[in-house]
């Protein structure tokens, strides 16, 4: 992953900027959460390793009718090189644990912040 299409800019966005915007959005979700996120919907837990972005998208895309995570879903699609549709689990190597969307977002945010602080943008 070397270059991403921007959501708010006309040209390509550097990976560090795209990751920063994803983190900002996840921070926004966690800070503004009042009622249970996505009505407490459950999603598959993922391994936060290689293929993480596609796996995260494949997990979250199965949550429908939740406007709070729609922007996150769009952003994750920019990180995933292949098209992802609901019910697709090619990147979800382990499907044995379901967690609430709120916990999923928190876990993902914690990992992405660590990657950013370490300078791992790709």
């Amino acid at each position: 992953l070397t270059c991403l299409g921007g959501f708010a800019s006309p040209g390509p966005v550097p990976p560090s900027t795209a990751l920063r915007e994803l983190i900002e959005e996840l921070v926004n979700i966690t800070q503004n959460q009042k009622a249970p996120l996505c009505n407490g919907s459950m999603v598959w837990s993922i391994n936060l390793t290689a293929g993480m972005y596609c796996a995260a998208l494949e997990s979250l895309i199965n949550v429908s009718g939740c406007s709070a995570i729609e922007k996150t879903q769009r952003m994750l699609s920019g990180f995933c090189p292949h098209k992802v549709s609901a019910g697709q689990f090619s990147s979800l190597h382990v499907r044995d644990t379901k967690i609430e969307v709120a916990q999923f977002v928190k876990d993902l945010l914690l990992h992405l912040k660590k990657l950013f602080r370490e300078g791992q943008f790709n």
Partner: antibody, heavy 123, light 106 residues
Framework: QVTLKESGPGILQPSQTLSLTCSFS??????????VGWIRQPSGKGLEWLAH???????RYNPALKSRLTISKDTSSSQVFLKIASVDTADTATYYC???????????????WGQGTTLTVSS | DIVLTQSPASLAVSLGQRATISCRAS??????????MNWYQQTPGQPPKLLIK???NLESGIPARFSGSGSGTDFTLNIHPVEEEDTATYYC?????????FGGGT
Amino acid sequence: QVTLKESGPGILQPSQTLSLTCSFSGFSLSTSDMGVGWIRQPSGKGLEWLAHIWWDDVKRYNPALKSRLTISKDTSSSQVFLKIASVDTADTATYYCARIGTNYGYDGLFDYWGQGTTLTVSS
Amino acid sequence: DIVLTQSPASLAVSLGQRATISCRASQSVSTSSYSYMNWYQQTPGQPPKLLIKYASNLESGIPARFSGSGSGTDFTLNIHPVEEEDTATYYCQHSWEIPYTFGGGT
């Protein structure tokens, strides 16, 4: 109440190693998203960021000085340490430690500063 | 490295008037939502004090006469009305990427 205090040798000779200690209170480096950094300022000049360390031991250095810098922490005693190898007269400056006050958990802005400790490098 | 250029280098302002300090970055330090630019005040013999974070967010305990604005590469610190105790050196600093750098001061 957040406070930070730097301590150092005051005077060193060229080629010696500088050891700095930052002792802090009012926050903990075991808290998520917390970090402490070092910034220096030669007398009458501007500010230069040197290094910082995060709660989970992620360390970042100024690339221009990276080969000479080592940052570490002792969470239990609320201290952060910086070593600078092979000091020269260009390292004469006031050295500040500062708490990272990020909203997002990865960017380095500094919301509380110590009073600074002065280093003079002279033969 | 991102270079921050402050202007003017020095500034004299009458009490009660407006002081405007500019900071230009050599590349953008903004996303679509936030700008990673901060402002500090330093008086002689004292450490810097954070005034404004993320371009426009006033730090807790800082008087409302300080304000920040800008995005992308161009940022401004305004002080109005200026008081005598505001006599100091002001620095901008980006928190966009390593290495974090400071402007030369005003």
